[in-house]
């Protein structure tokens, strides 16, 4: 008595597909060791066909696969374009031979079957309509027409001329004629459901002069496509259920036992298990549509259904397509937080993953917005402008070849709590969605700026001070120019490690930027930010004005560009986890750090946060310390 | 809601045969997987074999102990599962009871099936 467990016979029919399941005990050894699929040889030998180590036969080449999926304790066997001689007896097993643990399973592939020379075969799917052509005679002109369907030696009306329609076809079937025809007449079966499957008859005239043809309606149950994704991945349902229902509402559901529970459909309903990481788009006038549902759980794994009908709701006898999706958990996706904290004024980091085979892709970062459909507008990208409303406060750190780069979003408001997904134009599968929960500030921010209005004067001398805690003592200060499409970071000197870490002076950590002169082009967003190697930390963003001299006038303080950020301080809201390559920016001989500007920099520091984002830099008129 | 009624069950010598039939309501018969259980005396329910299709490829289950003597078949235009049960020994007897659920994870086991019927008895005399 084998422990393995599986289907012990398969049938089916030339062309089609079959997908064997096999169930193995669940142990250790057994979910790592080889999984194979072999044939029986007369000689005894069981020849592999295809096996979990990679090996794949001539024969099954691009018609097999086999996929283990260790959290079941099963792996399935699909094989795709059957014919007669795939006929025969088979084992799926496990073991670095054929002669391990292993099942019996006999597969039989038959002909497409045939009818009656007078029989025409309707095949169609659920929720379609059939036209069955019934020929007759000329003298049976002016007589009864009829559809009736055999069960068993009976024959029951369908429909006839007088305008009989059996209840159970009660608004799906008409029958009519074409034209001027006046030896055919058509019955039009609409929204197919599998009990209309059968053998019909079609009869003009009574008696034995009655014309009669056999019609065999199959209705075909949407054969499920098999979908096999990786955990933390995404995947995407592509519907095309026909212009008939173009104008329908669509959705889709997943199937729980008896019932198909929508996750989301154009009506605007959604599940909220799917909040933050679903899309609906249609993608085009004849019905098409697709879903894509990120950040795939374990328990996403199951069957799905899309639909089309007015309610939005599954509805029999309307057109569906199937899926069944697996999850695997031996995922080449990383695990990234799905949840990031902040506080108000503050900021946060947010790692996302990517293929790190394709670093030259390019990088997005979205916010997923819950309209009817859910969409998610493109917020920064490594070649797309930061969004209007961003600006300052959002960008994107690229760090190619790590499989990873980092968005920082600072002067964070309670408006910024949502949905935000990682993608890139490569590797579809590699989305990740994050939530963002921004709570209000409850003490002062860990890095705080002076002068809180920073107004330079042209052809003056201007700096900067950024004061940070003793728990930053051993990361890298940076001071960067927040450009739309970076922020540029400048060479940096800090003060505060100079001193022994033990006799850390809480006031006296201060990482300075000096403009020496001051040109037009030094107005904008700075950002003060720590980080440990290339895994980025906080960040606080200050706006300096520049104006020109005006002689006798007093400063202006600039626009109310840094009020956004003033409202509350914030804590440490993540930590990240990914590398990146400093961009240096090239030194302009105007730039200069004088130590004793950092010694004299005033200490009455405003609470200030912001957001940036790092790219590379060609110059930059600004150099911090 | 599919309702599922066992017929078929009856007493008979060791070595002969039974076919047992589960008729299923329900316009949807086709999206059912249908199975065999039995319940021995004084003992727990077991599985006995499953039949599952999906378009017009057909998966058939059977419990090792009666490999080679039942074999489970279906008639979708009757809505009808039968269990046609061969060489019939002593220990088959039991109460046998039809299962249907849309979805199963692992054929043999019970509790992933939905709809039961009320079971029909089947004794096997030596």
């Known amino acids: 008595q084998s422990p393995i467990f599986g289907p012990q016979d398969v049938s089916s029919i030339e062309g089609n597909s079959v997908s064997i399941t096999c169930y193995y005990p669940d142990t250790s050894v057994n979910r790592h060791t080889r999984k194979y699929w072999c044939r029986q040889g007369a000689n005894g030998y069981c020849a592999t066909l295809i096996s979990s180590n990679g090996y794949l036969s001539k024969e099954y080449s691009g018609r097999a696969s086999l996929i283990n999926f260790p959290e079941n304790s099963t792996f399935v066997i699909n094989i795709a374009h059957l014919t007669q001689e795939d006929t025969g007896s088979y084992k799926c097993g496990l073991g670095t031979t054929n002669r391990g643990l292993f099942f019996d399973v006999s597969l039989e592939v038959s002909q497409v079957p045939e009818f009656p020379n007078d029989t025409h075969v309707y095949t169609k799917d659920i929720g379609r309509t059939v036209t069955i052509e019934c020929r007759f005679k000329e003298g049976n002109a002016h007589s009864k027409k009829s559809l009736c369907k055999k069960r068993g030696e009976a024959c029951e009306v369908v429909i006839d001329s007088t305008e009989y329609v059996d209840p159970s076809y009660k608004d799906r079937a008409i029958l009519f004629m074409k034209g001027t025809s006046r030896d055919i007449f058509y019955v039009n079966i609409s929204h197919l459901i599998p009990s209309d499957a059968g053998l019909y008859v079609c009869q003009a005239g009574e008696g034995p002069s009655a014309d009669k043809n056999n019609a065999d309606l199959q209705v075909l149950e949407p054969e499920p496509e098999l979908l096999y994704k990786d955990l933390r991945s995404s995947v995407t349902f592509e519907c095309d259920l026909g212009r008939e229902v173009a104008n329908d509402a669509k959705y889709l559901c997943r199937k729980n036992k008896e019932t198909c529970d929508v996750i989301i459909n154009t009506l605007g309903k959604r599940d909220p298990a799917f909040e933050g990481r679903i899309l609906l788009t249609p993608r085009d006038d004849n019905g098409r549509f697709s879903v894509l549902i990120t950040g795939l759980r374990k328990e996403d794994a199951g069957h799905y259904q899309c639909g089309a009908h007015s309610s939005g709701l599954p509805q029999e006898g309307w057109p569906v397509q199937a899926w069944q999706l697996f999850v695997n958990e031996e995922s080449t996706i990383p695990n990234s937080r799905s949840v990031v904290k902040g506080v108000t004024g503050g900021s946060v980091a947010i790692v996302c993953p990517y293929n790190p085979k394709e670093s030259s892709s390019l990088k997005y970062w979205c916010h997923w917005e819950a309209d009817e459909n859910g969409r998610c507008p493109v917020l920064v990208g490594t070649q797309a402008l930061v969004q209007e409303g961003y600006e300052g406060r959002l960008a994107l750190f690229d760090q190619p070849g790590s499989g990873a780069y980092t968005v920082i979003l600072n002067q964070l408001t309670t408006q910024d709590s949502g949905f935000y997904w990682c993608l890139t134009d490569g590797d579809s599968r590699w989305r990740t969605t994050i939530e963002l929960q921004v709570a209000e500030a409850t003490k002062k921010p860990d890095l705080e700026v002076t002068p809180q209005n920073a107004t330079a004067v042209i052809g003056e001398t201007f700096t900067i001070s950024c004061h940070y805690p003793c728990k930053f003592y051993s990361q890298e200060k940076y001071w960067c120019k927040w450009s739309n499409d970076g922020c540029h970071i400048l060479p940096s000197h800090d003060e505060g490690a100079r001193q022994s870490s033990v006799s850390c002076d809480q006031s006296s950590q201060i990482v300075s930027m000096t403009l020496n002169p001051v040109k037009k082009e030094d107005e904008g967003w700075y950002w003060c930010g720590v980080k440990e190697g290339q895994v980025y930390g906080e960040t606080t963003a200050i706006y300096v004005a520049v104006e020109e001299r005006t002689r006798g006038s007093p400063h202006i303080n600039p626009t109310d560009a840094n009020a956004r950020a003033k409202d509350a301080p914030e804590e440490e809201a993540m930590e990240s986890s990914v590398r990146e390559d400093e961009n240096k920016a090239n030194l302009d001989p105007r730039l200069f750090a004088d130590e004793r500007e950092i010694q004299n920099a005033g200490d009455q520091a405003q609470e200030n946060r912001a957001s940036g984002n790092a790219g590379s830099a060609g110059g930059q008129s600004g150099s911090s310390k | 809601q599919v309702q599922l009624v066992e017929s078929g069950g009856g007493l008979v010598q060791a070595g002969d045969s039974l076919r047992l039939s589960c008729a299923a309501s329900?316009?949807?018969?086709?999206?059912?997987?249908m199975g065999w259980f039995r319940q021995p005396p004084g003992k727990e329910r077991e599985f006995v074999a499953t039949?599952?299709?999906?378009?017009?490829?057909?998966?058939?289950y059977y419990a090792d102990s009666v490999k080679g003597r039942f074999t489970i078949s279906r008639d979708n235009a009757k809505n009808t599962v039968y269990l046609q049960m061969n060489s019939l020994k002593p220990e088959d007897t039991a109460v046998y009871y039809c299962?249907?659920?849309?979805?199963?994870?692992?054929?043999?086991?019970?509790?992933?099936?939905?709809?039961w019927g009320q079971g029909t008895q089947v004794t096997v005399s030596s």
């Open positions: 039949i599952s299709w999906s378009g017009s490829t057909t998966y058939k």
């Open positions: 299962a249907a659920s849309t979805v199963v994870a692992d054929p043999r086991a019970p509790n992933e099936y939905d709809y």
């Open positions: 329900g316009r949807t018969f086709t999206t059912y997987v």
